[in-house]
């Protein structure tokens, strides 16, 4: 069952999934000047059996001008998106190595893909939030959102993360300094 809405937006924060539940779709979007190849699938789909999950279909982009040249899925190293190594990214890489049953890993980039990935999430999906670079967590309660089905409708739980750009914590005496939180997620993503 697809989630009706996008995960909630949190001011000055981005979200990321560690792994994607079977049934998740990722739009094959191309960057400006490129388009999906004619025979190409409009999306990738996370599918699997009892032992293994993987992405069905591959996204391929071709130049809008040159109609006969297709681009391969595997990106050239210099084309790969630059990623900031953060605590959350390492957590994700760790989670990637320990594959969750019934989940797919983050699909590798394809050449000339759009800068923002559009996912269609399914019920049971969890996404994790983090303050963007330059902001810190004023309050970090549960910083994740889960797509749940209630009364026949899907809804995302509300993450309890408040990010602020103010650098001086106004703390009352005797309270220890909170742990500095990592800066930002490797990439932002959206869903439709």
């Amino acid at each position: 069952e697809l989630c009706d809405d996008d995960p909630p937006k949190i001011t000055h924060a981005t979200f990321k999934a560690v792994a994607y539940k079977e049934g998740t779709m990722l739009n094959c979007e191309c960057k400006r000047g490129f388009r999906r190849i004619k025979s190409g699938s409009p999306y990738m789909l996370c599918t699997g059996n009892s032992s293994h999950s993987s992405w069905d279909n591959q996204c391929q982009c071709t130049s809008s001008a040159a109609r006969n040249t297709t681009k391969q899925v595997t990106p050239q190293p210099e084309e790969q998106k630059e990623r900031k190594t953060t605590e959350m990214q390492s957590q994700m890489q760790l989670a990637d190595q320990v594959s969750l049953p019934g989940h797919c890993r983050e699909p590798p980039p394809w050449e000339n893909e759009a800068t923002e990935r559009i996912y269609h999430f399914v019920v049971g999906q969890t996404v994790y939030y983090q303050c963007v670079q330059g902001y810190r967590a004023l309050h970090r309660g549960p910083a994740e959102s889960v797509c749940k089905m209630t009364h026949g409708k899907t809804r995302w739980t509300q993450p309890q993360l408040i990010c602020t750009g103010e650098t001086e914590p106004s703390q009352f005496p005797g309270e220890e300094e909170p742990q500095a939180s990592p800066d930002g997620l490797p990439e932002s993503e959206t869903s439709r």
Epitope: I10, H139, R140, G141, I162, S170, Q171
Partner: antibody
Framework: QVQLQQPGAELVRPGVSLKISCKGS????????MHWVRQSHAKSLEWIGV????????LYNQKFKGKATMTVDKSSSTAYLELARLTSEDSAIYYC????????WGQGTTLTVSS | DVVMTQSPASLSASVGETVTITCRAS??????LEWYQQKQGKSPQLLVY???TLAEGVPSRFSGSGSGTQFSLKINSLQPEDFGTYYC?????????FGGGTKLEMK
């Protein structure tokens, strides 16, 4: 069920300070930040600030800096709003509200400052 | 500070009618907007958060829409318990600010 309990009313003399309490129950207190909001006839609803119930880190509306101080006591699951040097202008209803979306509110403390 | 302007300031309607309340932000608030209902002598109650998500337990006759600077709250088929004052509030950056309120009265 989730409850935010506040004292119903306070009557104080001008010039004094007052600490209003807001006790959370029915949920994990430190999971949700606590906001404070003022309601007066003149100004409708005004956001005073927000405090992390976990770390005690607070963020204030510039307008209330020097007037309001927010604190928390995790052991009793209580948030406090201290108002300094009270004047008749501070007479209003003061609410605590929970979390990012203010999903639960206390019943409000009606403050009357009068000599 | 972001100024939230609500209109109308007051509104008379009958049970069964559909009403729409609007809220305009002086700056882009994206979808960081909540709607609250307040009954006389009671504290405000969350109706809608993030511009369009209904809070738990809120009847489906309520719906929120809009983004950026223009937002609206629609109530289909008004019920007797819907009369009261409605407030919008943005939470994109501090200070969070509220609209002046719309008082919905029974005609």
């Amino acid at each position: 069920q989730v409850q935010l309990q506040q004292p119903g009313a306070e009557l104080v003399r001008p010039g004094v300070s007052l600490k209003i309490s807001c006790k959370g129950s029915g949920y994990t207190f430190t999971d949700y930040a606590m906001h404070w909001v003022r309601q007066s006839h003149a100004k409708s609803l005004e956001w005073i600030g927000v405090i992390s119930t976990y770390s005690g880190d607070a963020l204030y509306n510039q307008k209330f800096k020097g007037k309001a101080t927010m604190t928390v006591d995790k052991s009793s699951s209580t948030a406090y709003l201290e108002l300094a040097r009270l004047t008749s202008e501070d007479s209003a209803i003061y609410y605590c509200a929970r979390g990012v979306t203010f999903d639960y509110w206390g019943q409000g403390t009606t403050l009357t400052v009068s000599s | 500070d972001v100024v939230m302007t609500q209109s109308p300031a007051s509104l008379s309607a009958s049970v069964g009618e559909t009403v729409t309340i609007t809220c305009r932000a002086s700056e882009n608030s994206y979808s960081y907007l909540e709607w609250y209902q307040q009954k006389q002598g009671k504290s405000p109650q969350l109706l809608v958060y993030n511009a369009k998500t209904l809070a738990e337990g809120v009847p489906s006759r309520f719906s929120g829409s809009g983004s950026g600077t223009q937002f609206s709250l629609k109530i289909n088929s008004l019920q007797p318990e819907d009369f009261g004052t409605y407030y919008c509030q943005h939470h994109y950056g501090t200070p969070y600010t509220f609209g002046g309120g719309t008082k919905l009265e029974m005609k």
